[in-house]
């Protein structure tokens, strides 16, 4: 129902803590360069204003929309043009155009230094001094680097962070308690970020219908005992929640997500038998738990899919009468039978089914035409299955770092024009799929691998959109979201690429590499590997292995040497010569 004061309504629903957290996230995602202190000041002002509206909904400006209130706050920031350039032009517009303008200026790759974690002792000191400010900093730093991070989920990760610090800061060895736990939260949060970005891309590029199809498939896999009406209701609600978060309406998003969690917990009987443990948790944990709840047991008596969608003489009539409902039913029925498929694959199958009906229902004898449609699904199913087998075999053979290198070579050959840092980031992320998915049971591998790869490739597309350099990448990124991964997989060596000149300085290293953390060392080596491939795109795997082994040996030797600098300056040029010879 309509409320006299939207801001008072949201403040009451969410409570002060979550309200402040969400406003901070919203401001940090819109104005990514502002300091924590600047944003914290705005958040306090907005919160104080919300409280006046709670006390009196008729007070001045309390009836204004949240976009108007937040936009006015952002536009009042001093030196907006100096710091943000043309984003300041958004402030000349009226709502809703102003908010759309802010959204368009969100930067997926802001030039901010990596978020460095302070050393344990210092972290615990500042956490103990002021937990609220400490958590505020966390929300601010994550939100500004990930402008589409799912806001209620970021509150959940902040809560996790808080719990870890509370526990570990009381331990004698804070470092060994904190590091693995915080690494775990960081890894999960980064995956959450790319997944949510993919959802927002789906919504932005292809609209609500595309997202709703994704939701129907995903929910049908998880809740195979729920009927189509229930799945449709959940998908509609989930689409609304995600639309709001992707659109910067974070208070509404978090409020509606809480409502959806409440609905699911009140209707477990018609949704799933697996929800109770989630529903026993407090709000943030409950919603998080529900979002990744295990699949319910599939009903034992499901009839063959062919009965309603191939053998039935009424197929075209049903399709004509209500296309979206009929296709939605197909997607629901197919998905609930296949928790072992990726959502991307299920959507490709639904698309194939739709294309078949479009073609066949226009013929004089439709049943004869669409009768073979399920058999035509086979190659679409085999392709990702083979992808999973090939890549997991390779991962098991090479380990994560070696697997990342294999992917880096492959992708540098596919798109050598892409910047080396982007290729290295993409390959490292794509390579993590092995650790994340290949260790899972067989029936969980395909959905894990393909849906994760799709999310990572979406990021590649977003970064490439900013500075398009590769026709290969443009081609794959301009198609539908579900076709991207197969498109990238099918790419081969870019024959149009003119190899880079060999520059000795690209392969010149200094003793400072020895003191770098292992991850940074790997990135340096992978940067060199990408540059090698750009120099010799058709180098064989054997040639590249020879060079990289030599390189690793060189680093190992010089980093162990008494006089590291001398070793690097004398052995470095020899390494460069050997590399050139090996690749000649």
């Amino acid at each position: 129902e309509a409320h006299k004061s939207e801001i008072a309504h949201r403040y009451n629903d969410l409570g002060e803590q979550h309200f402040k957290g969400l406003v901070l996230i919203a401001f940090s995602q819109y104005l990514q360069k502002c300091s924590y202190d600047e944003h914290a000041k705005l958040v306090q002002e907005v919160t104080d204003f919300a409280k006046t509206c709670v006390a009196d909904e008729s007070a001045a400006n309390c009836d204004k929309s949240l976009h108007t209130l937040f936009g006015d706050k952002l536009c009042a920031i001093p030196n907006l043009r100096e710091n943000y350039g043309e984003l300041a032009d958004c402030c000349t517009k009226q709502e809703p155009e102003r908010n759309e303008c802010f959204l368009q200026h969100k930067d997926d790759n802001p030039s901010l230094p990596p978020f460095e974690r302070p050393e344990a002792e210092a972290m615990c000191t500042s956490f103990k001094e002021n937990p609220t400010t400490f958590m505020g900093h966390y929300l601010h730093e994550v939100a500004r680097r990930h402008p589409y991070f799912y806001a209620p989920e970021l509150l959940y990760y902040a809560e996790q962070y808080n719990e870890i610090l509370t526990q570990c800061c009381a331990e004698a060895d804070k470092e060994s308690c904190l590091t693995p736990k915080l690494d775990g939260v960081k890894e999960k949060a980064l995956v959450s970020s790319v997944r949510q970005r993919m959802k927002c891309s789906s919504m932005q590029k292809f609209g609500e219908r595309a997202f709703k199809a994704w939701a129907v498939a995903r929910l049908s896999q998880t809740f195979p005992n729920a009927d189509f009406a229930e799945i449709t209701k959940l998908a509609t609600d989930l689409t609304k929640v995600n639309k709001e978060c992707c659109h910067g309406d974070l208070l509404e998003c978090a409020d509606d997500r809480a409502e959806l969690a409440k609905y699911m917990c009140e209707n477990q009987a018609t949704i799933s038998s697996k929800l109770q443990t989630c529903c026993d948790k407090p709000l943030l944990k409950k919603a998080h738990c529900l979002s990744e709840v295990e699949h319910d047991t599939m009903p034992a008596d499901l009839p063959a899919i062919a009965a309603d969608f191939v053998e039935d003489q009424e197929v075209c009539k049903n399709y004509a009468e209500a296309k979206d409902v009929f296709l939605g039913t197909f997607l629901y029925e197919y998905s609930r039978r296949h928790p072992d498929y990726s959502v991307s694959l299920l959507l490709r199958l639904a698309k194939k089914y739709e294309a078949t009906l479009e073609k066949c229902c226009a013929e004089a004898n439709p049943p004869a035409c669409y009768g073979t449609v399920l058999a035509e699904f086979q190659p679409l199913v085999e392709e990702p299955k083979n992808l999973v087998k090939t890549n997991c075999d390779l991962y098991e053979k090479l380990g994560e770092y070696g697997f990342q290198n294999a992917i880096l070579v492959r992708y540098t050959q596919k798109a050598p024009q892409v910047s080396t840092p982007t290729l290295v980031e993409a390959a490292r992320n794509l390579g993590r799929v092995g650790t994340k998915c290949c260790t899972l049971p067989e029936d969980q591998r395909l959905p894990c691998v393909e849906d994760y790869l799709s999310a990572i490739l979406n990021r590649v597309c977003l970064l490439h959109e900013k500075t398009p350099v590769s026709e290969h990448v443009t081609k794959c990124c301009s198609g539908s979201l579900v076709e991207r991964r197969p498109c990238f997989s099918a790419l081969t060596v870019d024959e149009t690429y003119v190899p880079k000149e060999f520059k000795a300085e690209t392969f010149t290293f200094h003793s400072d590499i020895c003191t770098l953390p292992e991850k940074e060392k790997q990135i340096k080596k992978q940067t060199a590997l990408a540059e090698l491939v750009k120099h010799k795109p058709k180098a064989t795997a054997e040639q590249l292995k020879t060079v990289m082994d030599d390189f690793a040996q060189f680093l190992d030797t010089c980093c162990k040497a008494a006089d590291k600098d001398t070793c690097f300056s004398t052995e470095g040029p020899n390494l460069v010569t050997r590399c050139k010879d090996a690749l000649a």
């Epitope: 075209c316 004509a320 013929e363 004089a364 004898n365």
Partner: nanobody
Framework: EVQLVESGGGLVQPGNSLRLSCAAS????????MSWVRQAPGKGLEWVSS????????LYADSVKGRFTISRDNAKTTLYLQMNSLRPEDTAVYYC????????SSQGTLVTVSS
Amino acid sequence: EVQLVESGGGLVQPGNSLRLSCAASGFTFSRFGMSWVRQAPGKGLEWVSSISGSGSDTLYADSVKGRFTISRDNAKTTLYLQMNSLRPEDTAVYYCTIGGSLSPSSQGTLVTVSS
């Protein structure tokens, strides 16, 4: 909402002709193949003829081949059945249906062939 309304039926003598029409609405007519089916008194449904969305392909039951002609006007979203050399055994309620459907969702039009 999909609607199919048949018309043109009536009482005719054997050997004469009739032209049935089916006005369609509520869906993209040109993208669907259409059929005529019929049900004689006390009998089951029998497929008569089908036509593709573009009108280029047609199919006929052996019992009507050479006597009946199916056609369509996509601009008017109307399906036709020209019935020549009618016989008493053609007496039935005629229905138009979408695609390969054999279960009509319309009222149909009655054709009676009798001397």
